[in-house]
Amino acid sequence: QPNNSLMLQTSKENHALASSSLCMDEKQITQNYSKVLAEVNTSWPVKMATNAVLCCPPIALRNLIIITWEIILRGQPSCTKAYKKETNETKETNCTDERITWVSRPDQNSDLQIRTVAITHDGYYRCIMVTPDGNFHRGYHLQVLVTPEVTLFQNRNRTAVCKAVAGKPAAHISWIPEGDCATKQEYWSNGTVTVKSTCHWEVHNVSTVTCHVSHLTGNKSLYIELLPVPGAKKSAK
């Protein structure tokens, strides 16, 4: 068992390898065809370590001439994955990440998949479909979400520290009850942020404090009983 003055509680969400997709089935394609084509760009938050499937505009493959996926990742040259129907050939340019692949053969399925999404997959993904009727685009601003690790501990009398470590985007920390708090943010080179909130409670009838961490990947609460003030022996409540 840890000492009360040391780290008392930690939490790290564990995600089974889930899949997320914005793709639609055939029925939806029929209903939403014009709407989807109008909605060219989509912001899409995806949890790290899940699988993601990105879709092209809902164009029947028989009408296709060329499909191109353009992938723009931070600090990388633009990667393109192209499929030409007439010659049944695929071509890749500047694509080095083996986790980003066609879902299956592009003549059967034009979707792109990212296996085990990482922070480095943050970026812009665009499918361009060339047809006799013109070019159709669909873009994704992929925002990779990282669940922060949450810790709560005491470092001195009636002062508690709550940390949300390496979250993306930054988590928000609140307390019950409210205390006299100072919050700092530390930005890491990989795009994650550590938020540290240090609070002091002068009011002596506060027994237990709760740190509530709000994040796009889910919320987490931890609580801790405050240590007594040194020298304080007896108190009637």
């Epitope: 068992q1 840890p2 000492n3 009360n4 003055s5 019950i176 009850p177 009838n205 506060v206 027994s207 237990t208 404090v209 709760t210 609460s221 931890l222 609580y223 801790i224 009983e225 240590l227 007594p228 003030v229 040194p230 304080a232 022996k233 007896k234 108190s235 409540k237």
Partner: antibody, heavy 114, light 107 residues
Framework: QVQLVQSGAEVKKPGASVKVSCKAS????????MHWVRQAPGQGLEWMGN????????NYDEKFQGRVTMTADTSTSTVYMELSSLRSEDTAVYYC???????WGRGTLVTVSS | DIQMTQSPSSLSVSVGDRVTITCQAS??????LHWFQQKPGKAPKLLIS???NLESGVPSRFSGSGSGTEFTFTISSLQPEDAATYYC?????????FGQGTKLEIK
């Protein structure tokens, strides 16, 4: 896993005192508040107070102020709750609890009867 | 002191039904709480800690929600063994205070 073992049932006369013990194991005894809660027959739960064994710091509910004394023996990891000037309405099961109320003893029945 | 108003005080429900119990803290003061189950002659058993965390070994039909001053305890599908009295406990402020209890009977 935290275990709290309480002393056995007591029968006392009005005006007497009773001392209930609670021996803790499975956690750092001096680092967690220990609380006492009582429950009269057919009634709800009532918090009496708490003690921090590491410093001896205590909080008593004002209802029991002057009649209750909580102490801790760090050498045996045991806390004590003594209630004096007993009256019939003090007949209750007395529980010790720790780890922010997540671990409870089995309770000690104190019967006050003439 | 923070008063915890728990309702209802009693209810009689059929097996398989959904049960909801609420606790509200007085003075509009935000608190944190636990939910306990107590059967006759036994110590209270912690079911939900910190308003919404299901304790290890507790069936998933039990759940807790809410924050601030209003909290809800739910049994999604009542089982015969759930007949008991249920209490909330606020542990943010001294003195700690319990709700008055909800006695749950099976029809």
């Amino acid at each position: 896993q935290v275990q709290l073992v309480q002393s056995g049932a007591e029968v006392k006369k009005p005006g007497a005192s009773v001392k209930v013990s609670c021996k803790a194991s499975g956690h750092t005894f001096t680092s967690y508040w220990m609380h006492w809660v009582r429950q009269a027959p057919g009634q709800g739960l009532e918090w009496m107070g708490n003690i921090y064994p590491g410093s001896g710091s205590i909080n008593y509910d004002e209802k029991f102020q002057g009649r209750v004394t909580m102490t801790a023996d760090t050498s045996t990891s045991t806390v004590y709750m003594e209630l004096s000037s007993l009256r019939s309405e003090d007949t209750a099961v007395y529980y010790c609890l720790t780890m922010t109320g997540t671990s409870w003893g089995r309770g000690t029945l104190v019967t006050v009867s003439s | 002191d923070i008063q915890m108003t728990q309702s209802p005080s009693s209810l009689s429900v059929s097996v398989g039904d959904r049960v909801t119990i609420t606790c509200q803290a007085s003075q509009g003061t935000p608190i944190n709480l636990h939910w306990f189950q107590q059967k006759p002659g036994k110590a209270p058993k912690l079911l939900i800690s910190g308003a919404s965390n299901l304790e290890s070994g507790v069936p998933s039909r039990f759940s807790g929600s809410g924050s601030g001053t209003e909290f809800t305890f739910t049994i999604s599908s009542l089982q015969p063994e759930d007949a008991a009295t249920y209490y909330c406990l606020q542990f943010t402020y001294i003195p700690w205070t319990f709700g008055q209890g909800t006695k749950l009977e099976i029809k």
